[in-house]
Amino acid sequence: MAVTACQGLGFVVSLIGIAGIIAATCMDQWSTQDLYNNPVTAVFNYQGLWRSCVRESSGFTECRGYFTLLGLPAMLQAVRALMIVGIVLGAIGLLVSIFALKCIRIGSMEDSAKANMTLTSGIMFIVSGLCAIAGVSVFANMLIQDFYNPLVAEALKRELGASLFVGWVAGGLTLIGGVMMCIACRGLAPEETNYKAVSYHASGHSVAYKPGGFKASTGFGSNTKNKKIYDGGARTEDEVQSYPSKHDYV
């Protein structure tokens, strides 16, 4: 039961994390205008990975996509790549982990296969989370370097946007979910892998005993190979909505 819970929770946490990574990647507020040095602005600038936006204090917002590919900074391209790799790996991991869930029965799939799939999805989630964290961190580092660079004009200095914090949290959740899946994998291993032959050396000759009266406990719950699981599958619904706000100007 503990294995199922760990696996299920790992799946849900990873699902939320990947939804967050997708949201962060699509959001426009990766960097925002430095309002500390320009607190009276009536025009608020903010940028995402795919477009830059201007919100006027009148409430009108205009966004323009980055229509060039070669003209963009290499760092921005690298961050885009990291986030996309994170999303792709996460999506594949989710697909694999759905089939690996103990509460879902697919034909006569062996526990060993489910264990392998759980481990695979766990590793994918870990790498996905690391990609997102790396991407967001690279972007944040770029902003911080520009902010403290005396050669960069004040008007061009940018602050860390909300998307970065969403990305860090989402990457962290995906990473945690992946770790949980890897932990669950250890408890999913079939019975045979749980018992080890124990060798005793007595009075000059060797006698091997294979214990049959007890099971070596892994500490991750009892073996449930022959039990029916009736746990309901978790469903999550993530809606990401963005509304313009005038509070960005003062």
């Epitope: 602005t41 009536a42 025009v43 600038n45 201007v54 006027e56 009108f60 061009l156 005038k246 509070h247």
Partner: antibody, heavy 118, light 113 residues
């Protein structure tokens, strides 16, 4: 069509506060900022401040911070500007305007002529 | 606060003539995010409230005759009336819409001979 209706004139005694009104019609009142502009006789224009009717968020020109208070009544789609302790310096035409693209003011009320006199 | 300086303070022209008036700001009104200048031109006829002519320094408001043209960038702006009509008799104001408080120029009074 969009209209901003203001009373033509107000007479107030020095020191007695006055509340000027601006009734909006022909558009969604809560979606656009309302600005107030002062014009003294034969003089230029001065921006007093603005208010976002949806949540009454305000910005003020520091010069008028202690003089003007902007409010709205969403139910009647009316914006108000209260002037405290008016003096002869406050005698002017006060316009309410609506914010538009480029933070410009696309619609203007006809203006209220405020006379401060004893 | 951004200071807006208009020149000349008044000018007299004959109908059909081309006229230009200047507006200078103490700080740049160019926004790097969209490369737009946050400067607006208004026309105020005697006894009337101001009327929006041009925003973003060069974008004509709908219904404004195309003889009115706004140009300039950064701190120097110009309003041009290609062929002045009798009904253009008014005071023309420029306004900073880039940062609070929004500030107006002192105006250019256009008179027709």
């Amino acid at each position: 069509q969009v209209q901003l209706q203001q009373p033509g004139a107000e007479l107030v005694r020095p020191g007695a506060s006055v509340k000027l009104s601006c009734k909006a019609s022909g558009y969604t009142f809560t979606s656009y900022w309302i600005n107030w502009v002062k014009q003294r006789p034969g003089q230029g224009l001065e921006w007093i401040g603005n208010i976002y009717p949806s949540d009454s968020y305000t910005n003020y020109n520091q010069k008028f911070k202690d003089k003007a208070t902007l409010t709205v009544d969403k139910s009647s789609s009316t914006a108000y500007m209260q002037l405290s302790s008016p003096t002869s310096e406050d005698s002017a035409v006060y316009y309410c305007t609506r914010s538009w693209r480029g933070n410009s003011f696309d619609y203007w009320g006809q203006g209220t002529t405020l006379t401060v006199s004893s | 606060d951004i200071v807006m300086t208009q020149s000349p303070s008044s000018l007299t022209v004959t109908a059909g003539e081309k006229v230009t008036m200047s507006c200078k700001s103490s700080q740049s009104l160019l926004n790097s995010g969209n490369q737009k200048n946050y400067l607006t031109w208004y026309q105020q006829k005697p006894g009337q409230p101001p009327k929006l002519l041009i925003y973003w320094a060069s974008t004509r408001e709908s219904g404004v005759p195309d003889r009115f043209t706004g140009s300039g960038s950064g701190t120097d702006f110009t309003l041009t009336i290609s062929s002045v009509q009798a009904e253009d008799l008014a005071v023309y104001y420029c306004q900073n819409d880039y940062s609070y408080p929004f500030t107006f120029g002192s105006g250019t009074k256009l008179e027709i001979k």
